[in-house]
Structure formats: C-alpha cells, structure tokens
C-alpha cells in the first residue's frame, strides 16, 4: 500500500507511470500501485527518491537528452535538484530542461528542452502535481544532532533507511540518522511518531492533565521549533495562568539557556498572540523586555532568570516548550446566535444572547464607566471570540478613531488580566505593539481602538468612552424583522443582504443554489465586510461556510464566481498553499479564516445580493 | 558512553539472609528499562527481573515471590532483592539497561557479579 507521502508519476497522454526498473533505467510501464519499482517520493525540498531502490532520480549533466537515471541520495548534488514549472512541468532545478518520455521512439525518460505534453507530470489518480505532495522536514528529538532534520535515506550498518527505524534498540523507539551516513557522522535524533514509550519524552502536570516536552538540547529557529511541535500535535508552549508558570519554572530549573516559546508578534498589524491562539492575560516579561527592537518578533522562556520571558529575533537557534493535552479554555461555551433569542432595550444591540451599547459621547475614568455599565444592568463588555469582536466592529456603529473602555483589567492581581464580569479569559486581540504595560505609569485597563478594535493597556485614569454589555432577556419566541431591502431571512448589512444555505453543499450545488435565489456566493471585499460575515457565521457548529472564492477556472490564480476583483484576504495559516479548490469561511477558534477544500466536500454557505432600493455606488477603478 | 556498575554478591547460604543487588547507571540517561538477567554455568542467559522507567514490574516463574526489583530515580539505581535463596540461584547476574542516549543503541549491559548460593 502507498504511505501518504508516496506517489505514483503519471503521463496523461501516454498513460503510463514512471517504472525504475534499476538504478540505471528509469522507464515507464502501466501503472500499478502495487508495484514498489514505480513508488516515489520527495526526500527532500528538491529530491525525488525511488522507494524500491531507495535512490534519488537524477542527471549526469544538466544538458539536453541525457537519461535520468537513479544515484545515491546526495542533497548537495545539482543533478538530483528538481522543481515543479508552471503547473505540471517537472524540471531540473535552474534550467528549462524537463522529465520527458516518449521522444525518439526512446524507452528511458530523458532530460529534454521540449515542454510539451510528454513533459507533464501528475500524480497517479489525482489531478496535482508532483509537488503537492512534497516533503515535510521531521525534526529530531533528543539524539546527539541538536534537533536537526531525518535525512532520508540514511545508512546505517551499511543498510539504507528511508523511514524512521527501530534497528539496534529492543525497545521500539524511532529514530533516523541526520545525515546520509549514520555510520560515519554518528549523528541521529528520535522521530516526532507515536510509538511504545514515546510518552516518557513528556512531562504531564497531574492537575491539569496537560503534558510538556521541553527540549533544550535542540538548537531550531522559532518557526523551526513550531513545526516540531505540531509534528506530535501540539503546540509551541502557551502559558495562561499563574500555577502554569509555576509548574514551568520548576521543570526548567536545572536548564540554563532560553527555550523558545509560543509567545510572538509575528501578524503584521495585531500585538502580542500566543501561537496555539490560547488568549494573551497573564505577562511575565524579563525586565527591558518586551524590547521594541525590529525583528524581535519571537520570545524564549530564559531558564537561567527564573523562567520569565524575552523577545528575540525568530532565526536564533534554541531549545524549545511543546504542549499538548486539555486546555482549560473549553470549558466556557459562547452560545451561538442562532441558538439565543434576544431582546434588548431601546438603543442597545442585540448579539448570541447578549445586548451592547456604545457610550461614546460622555467619556469616562474605566472605574466610573464600569459603575455606569453596572448600574443600567450590564458591565464593561467583556469578549470572547472573534465573532463577537467582529460584531461589536461591523454593527454596533464602532468607528475607526474610537478609543472605549472594554472590561479587561489586571487590577486585582498584576501581570493577570481577567474581565470585570467574571466571565473567563478565552481570547484577546492586542494592537500591535500591546500590552505594553509601561512601566513608568500603571497601565492596569483595557481599550479598544484602531480601525480594527484591537486592544491596548491604558492607564485607568483618562476619560474615554466605553462599551457596556447586559445578558438579554428572552420574551419568548422571537420576532423575526425583516431588514429594509432584504426579503425574510435574509440580513442587511451596509448595501447587502445575506442568507445563510443551511443544506450542506458542494461548491458548486452552493453555488446554483444560491443563482437560484438571485444571488451569488459571497464575495468579500474588506475588513470590515469580513468582521461581519464572521460574527454571521463564527459561532455555528458547522466547521466550513462556501465563499464564492476558488481557483476552478485558473489552477493558482483565486477568482469570485461573479466578476468582481479580488482586493481582500483572509487566509489561515499554511493557505492557500499549493493546493487548488475552493474557499470557505471556517468557524470556531479559526472564525472567519480562509480555508481551500476539495470543491466537491459539503459545506453550509453564505449568499448574498444587493439590497432593493440601495444606488450602486461607482466600481472603484484601478 | 554508558557505564553500568553492580555491586552485591558473593557467598550466600541458602535460605539464609536476604541478597540485595545494585546496579547504578554512570551517567544520568533517559532510560525505558533496567532488567537483571543470569546466566548459570553451561545455560542460556535468562531474565530474572524487569523495571520499566513508568514502575511496571516483571519477574521469571522461578524467582517469583522471592526476588523484588525496585528503584530509585534519585541515585539512578535499580536493586535486585533476592530472599529465600536456593542453590539452582546460583549464576552470574547482569544488569541490562534499555536507554535512550546519545547513539540509536539501546541495550547495555554490566559486567556481572558473581552469587553463589551454597552451604
């Protein structure tokens, strides 16, 4: 059977797949999954290897017709080095030179100028090409080799590995060589697999359930270090509560150099986030630090000095945290609109079972707006996710220039922001820059502002204005309004209505669907159209909502089913990647981010049209 | 790189008082296991008693109820106390720790020390 990281190559016109019948002729047959001589894989950024053969596909010469043949693996070599050209085109790195079968009544492939259809390449049973199923670095634990990448093939006892092995232990733990030739270099490392006994690389904190690897005799980048992490499903360490630190700098204490951990400020216009998304509330900075020094963008827990943290630049090698294991912050559940009817007083709005209200005319010391908020019933909003964030933004009348007080604090225990309602801690969106808490005066309160509504630490003491927010009461069954300009069950936001399609749907199902009711998938043309379709969606159960986005038309290039440019985006980490398909909203912690899925998956999704009786303002021009 | 080092043996009657083993590991290792072994003259090596870095214990048939492994993380040390001891207990014992270390070799073994259980 093929591993997920093993492909057949496929020629389209003639057929057939790449058959390495030895190392020195590399041919094509029909192609046969079963067969070992036409199993391949990527071995490295640029090397493809023969599975049978444990040889990676090469060139004597980097010049027109020679035959590829198969050589030992050597990631220095320039003749081993290929990449994928416009679509399906496999190449010699460097050179208009390409992977051909066919030309010359010539049985072996060649390396040939011409980059017509006998250079095109896929992988068998799929429409992608070689390099979408490209290779993955695995970071190394523990070993003698720092951490470093399994280099595979690796030999070992003059027999070559192309995966992870357990030869020469009795103990079934995984490990592979970090260089070509263990038995030369002796150098290796643990692979990031589960295995029998790969518990014991953990340490679990018996109050909490939650497990932590520290690894300090690694030396990885930041992003590095991340990746290590998620290779065992978890997560660069977030720290949240005190007892967390604690736990931590006890485990740590015999450790002398710095340990990366999850804290960065890594997104261009949002401040300090935790990498798991785990909310920013508890601080415990080295004094100077956070310095405001460009590039700093990553911070490391410093062992040595009572494990309190310091920013650093992201390309410094160190040891690092992981964490997997329960978090506390599910334990809080934010109903989701659709679940909660809500009434709200005249002048508040109503959101997931809850009523807000912008003050922004009387401005306020926080303590005298927090009694103001009490006294009508509510408190300083506290907020929980994005969507109510996003909500407060696109619908509450929040403008650009704001600067409001929200309830977020750290008065009663210093370093430790909770909210003034008591509701827990569950998220946070930092300006860029924040919390800076200044030393020089007391930054104990939260604002929000900036066209964004992200959130600074203030001093207490300025007038400003403020968000209150109050539990609604429910009156029953709901009134359901119909907006001006939109038809029932539809939602009017600025020149649009919105419709929710709640049968679960492929792309294109979603997309007629919506045709038929005069509309058209949703486009998303700012931040600000964004922030509501999330709040719109954010907190359904469902994973995925279609947008009108795909690259169906133009492998690579992203377009709306209607003709509209694309001028926003609001990708997820790791998207749109090389994958082609079709684009959803997700929900929950990643509410509102891009994802591309496979167009015929089913999904809920969006539609929306213009609103009856709303001018057509100018389209914008380039 | 790894050293293991046992100490205890000798003389013993038998039935006579307890014989405690100790097999210390020379460096700190993140070790899965310890294990005594034996090996009695003109026989196989055979395990006698396993101790995995979790606690899980695992004892031969013939030494059941009368041997007891036990550690101690602190002095990186794992003990063999053999009570009720029989003349066929005789034989080289070897201490055997699966570690994970600085190379992909998991097994070490002591140098053995001798018991002899005779009257």
């Known amino acids: 059977l093929l591993d997920t990281r093993q492909f057949l190559i496929y020629n389209e016109d003639h057929k057939r797949c790449v058959d390495a019948v030895s190392p020195s002729a590399v041919q094509t047959a029909a192609c046969n999954q079963d067969a070992e001589s036409q199993k391949f894989r990527w071995v490295s950024e640029s090397q493809i290897m023969s599975v049978a053969f444990k040889l990676c596909l090469g060139v004597p010469s980097k010049t027109d017709w020679v035959a590829i043949t198969l050589y030992a693996c050597d990631s220095k070599s320039e003749f081993q080095k290929w990449e994928c050209k416009n679509d399906t085109l496999l190449g010699i790195k460097g050179e208009d030179l390409f992977f051909n079968y066919g030309n010359r009544q010539e049985k072996n492939i060649m390396l040939y100028k011409g980059s017509g259809l006998w250079s095109r390449w896929k992988i068998y049973g799929t429409t992608d090409n070689l390099c979408s199923r490209g290779y993955e670095a695995m970071y190394t634990l523990l070993g003698n080799a720092n951490g470093a990448t399994c280099a595979f093939p690796f030999k070992f006892e003059n027999k070559w590995y192309a995966d992870c092995t357990s030869a020469g232990r009795s103990d079934g733990w995984l490990w592979c060589g970090t260089t070509t030739d263990y038995d030369t270099d002796k150098l290796f490392g643990y692979c990031p697999l589960k295995f029998e006994g790969s518990e014991s690389l953990w340490n679990k904190d018996p109050l909490t359930s939650v497990s932590y690897q520290i690894n300090s005799k690694s030396a990885l980048t930041w992003h590095q270090a991340r990746k290590s992490c998620q290779q065992q499903n978890a997560e660069l360490l977030s720290i949240t509560e005190i007892h967390e630190q604690t736990y931590l700098t006890g485990l740590t204490s015999s450790l002398t150099s710095g340990l990366w951990i999850g804290l960065n400020s890594l997104s261009f216009n949002s401040g300090w986030q935790w990498s798991d998304r785990s909310p920013f509330r508890y601080l415990n900075w080295l004094p100077g630090s956070p310095s405001a020094e460009p590039g700093k963008s990553c911070v490391s827990l410093n062992p040595g000095k009572n494990a309190k943290w310091e920013n650093l630049e992201c390309v410094q090698k160190l040891g690092y945290i992981c964490k997997k294991g329960n978090t506390t912050l599910n334990s809080f559940v934010i109903p989701s609109e659709s679940d909660v009817p809500t009434h709200c007083p005249s002048q508040w709005w109503p959101y997931a079972g809850h009523c807000y209200k912008i003050h922004r005319d009387e401005k306020k010391i926080q303590r005298d707006a927090l009694t103001t908020c009490r006294k009508e019933g509510g408190d300083l909003t506290s907020i929980h996710t994005i969507e109510e964030l996003d909500f407060i933004i696109s619908q509450l009348g929040y403008e650009p220039n704001d600067e409001l007080w929200i309830g977020l604090n750290d008065i009663k225990i210093q370093m430790y922001f909770e909210w003034s309602d008591g509701t827990p801690v569950t998220f946070t969106k930092w300006l860029r820059g924040e919390p800076s808490h200044e030393n020089n005066r007391q930054e104990d309160c939260v604002v929000m502002k900036g066209k964004d509504g992200y959130w600074a630490d203030r001093g207490c003491e300025w007038p400003l204005g403020y968000i209150c927010k109050m539990k609604s009461r429910s009156q029953g069954p709901e009134i359901v309004e119909v907006e001006k300009g939109c038809r029932k069950g539809w939602k009017k936001h600025h020149f649009y209505c919105y419709m929710i399609g709640h049968t679960l749907s492929t792309f294109a199902e979603a997309n007629q669907t919506c045709n038929n009711e005069n509309a058209y998938l949703t486009t998303i043309e700012d931040r600000y159209e964004q922030a509501f379709l999330t709040s719109f969606v954010g907190l359904r159960p469902e994973k995925y909502f279609w947008t009108g986005l795909s690259d169906i038309q133009t492998k690579g290039t992203f377009q709306w089913t209607i003709e509209e440019e694309v001028r926003f985006t609001h990708w997820n980490s790791d998207m749109p990647g090389r994958k082609p398909g079709c684009v959803a909203m997700r929900t929950g912690i990643a509410g509102g981010l891009w994802d591309v899925l496979k167009c015929d998956e089913k999904a809920k999704f969006v539609c929306k049209h213009w609103a009856e009786g709303v001018t057509h303002p100018p389209k914008p021009t380039t | 790189d790894v050293q293991l080092v046992e100490s205890g043996g000798g003389l013993v009657q038998p039935g006579g008082v307890s014989e405690t083993l100790l097999c210390s590991l020379w460096?700190?290792?993140?070790?899965?296991?310890h294990g005594w072994y034996r090996q009695a003259p003109g026989k196989q090596r055979e395990e006698v008693a396993a101790?995995?870095?979790?606690?899980?214990?695992n004892y031969a048939d013939s030494v059941k109820g009368r041997f007891t492994i036990s550690r101690d993380n602190a002095k990186n040390t794992v003990y063999l106390q053999m009570n009720s001891l029989k003349p066929e207990d005789t034989a080289v014992y070897y201490c055997?720790?699966?570690?994970?270390?600085?190379?992909?070799?998991?097994?070490?073994w002591g140098q053995g020390t001798l018991v002899t259980v005779s009257s």
């Open positions: 055997k720790a699966v570690v994970v270390t600085t190379t992909p070799y998991s097994d070490y």
């Open positions: 460096k700190h290792l993140h070790y899965q296991c």
């Open positions: 101790i995995t870095s979790g606690g899980s214990t």
